[in-house]
């Protein structure tokens, strides 16, 4: 049946603390994604910056999750608003910067 | 676009080994998706492996006892399928999108369809 928006959250962030513990050599080789504006609409726009990078493995579970909050398909080279266009990270220091934010809205009782 | 095989007739209790290949481009590159319809029902989610291989997620209906597995280097990926029962009766189906992760099976993406399916392959369970 449906995940609770809270479950789905939660595991979303389990997610990312894996990933930044695990983290051996640079995470998707140093690829550098889009930075994005952490706000309303946020899910969507993470997983348009994150579907731009091939063949990390390390990231399919995150843009899987992340799948789930987004209401519309994401294809690759699309872009919302929230893209920060002139500003790219590292994929290692997106996810930190997701994962805070993330904490924060768990925290807050913010679950969608 | 992908062609299943595999299917056939079993006793409850009974396993089969669902295969899926796509003979037009690389299944190595994309995660793949098991559905399956029974009669008169909308098509249901089964499974889905991601690329690589690393992330797998089941439909409760199937969870411990379908395994769902790839091999990167023949072009194939697989649905074992254990303990089956009559329920499980239905005509099986992968799907990709061409990307390399799996969708979100129950969250808000109703929006994330898959474009290209096989043309299924019948299994049933009866004694």
């Known amino acids: 049946g449906p995940v609770p928006p809270s479950t789905a959250l939660r595991e979303l962030i389990e997610e990312l603390v894996n990933i930044t513990q695990n983290q051996k050599a640079p995470l998707c080789n140093g690829s550098m994604v889009w930075s994005i504006n952490l706000t309303a609409g946020m899910y969507c726009a993470a997983l348009e910056s994150l579907i731009n990078v091939s063949g990390c493995s390390a990231i399919e579970k995150t843009q899987r999750m992340l799948s789930g909050f987004c209401p519309h398909k994401v294809s690759a080279g699309q872009f919302s608003s929230l893209h920060v266009r002139d500003t790219k990270i590292e994929v290692a220091q997106f996810v930190k910067d997701l994962l805070l934010h993330l904490k924060k809205l768990f925290r807050e009782g913010q679950f969608n | 676009q992908l062609v299943e095989s595999g299917g056939g007739s079993v006793q409850p209790g009974g396993s089969l080994r669902l295969s899926c290949a796509a003979p037009r481009f690389t299944l190595g590159s994309y995660a793949i998706a098991w559905f399956r319809q029974s009669p008169g029902k909308e098509r249901e989610w089964v499974s889905c492996?991601?690329?690589?291989?690393?992330?797998?997620i089941y439909s409760d209906s199937v969870k411990g006892r379908f395994t769902i597995s790839r091999d990167n280097t023949k072009n194939m990926v697989y649905l074992q399928m254990n303990s089956l029962n009559p329920e499980d009766t239905a005509v099986y189906y992968c799907?990709?999108?061409?990307?390399?992760?799996?969708?979100?099976?129950?969250?808000?993406?109703?929006?994330?369809?898959?474009?290209?399916w096989g043309q299924g392959t019948q299994v049933t369970v009866s004694s």
């Open positions: 799907a990709t999108d061409k990307r390399s992760f799996c969708y979100a099976p129950n969250g808000l993406g109703k929006g994330w369809t898959y474009d290209y």
């Open positions: 492996i991601s690329r690589s291989g690393g992330d797998t």
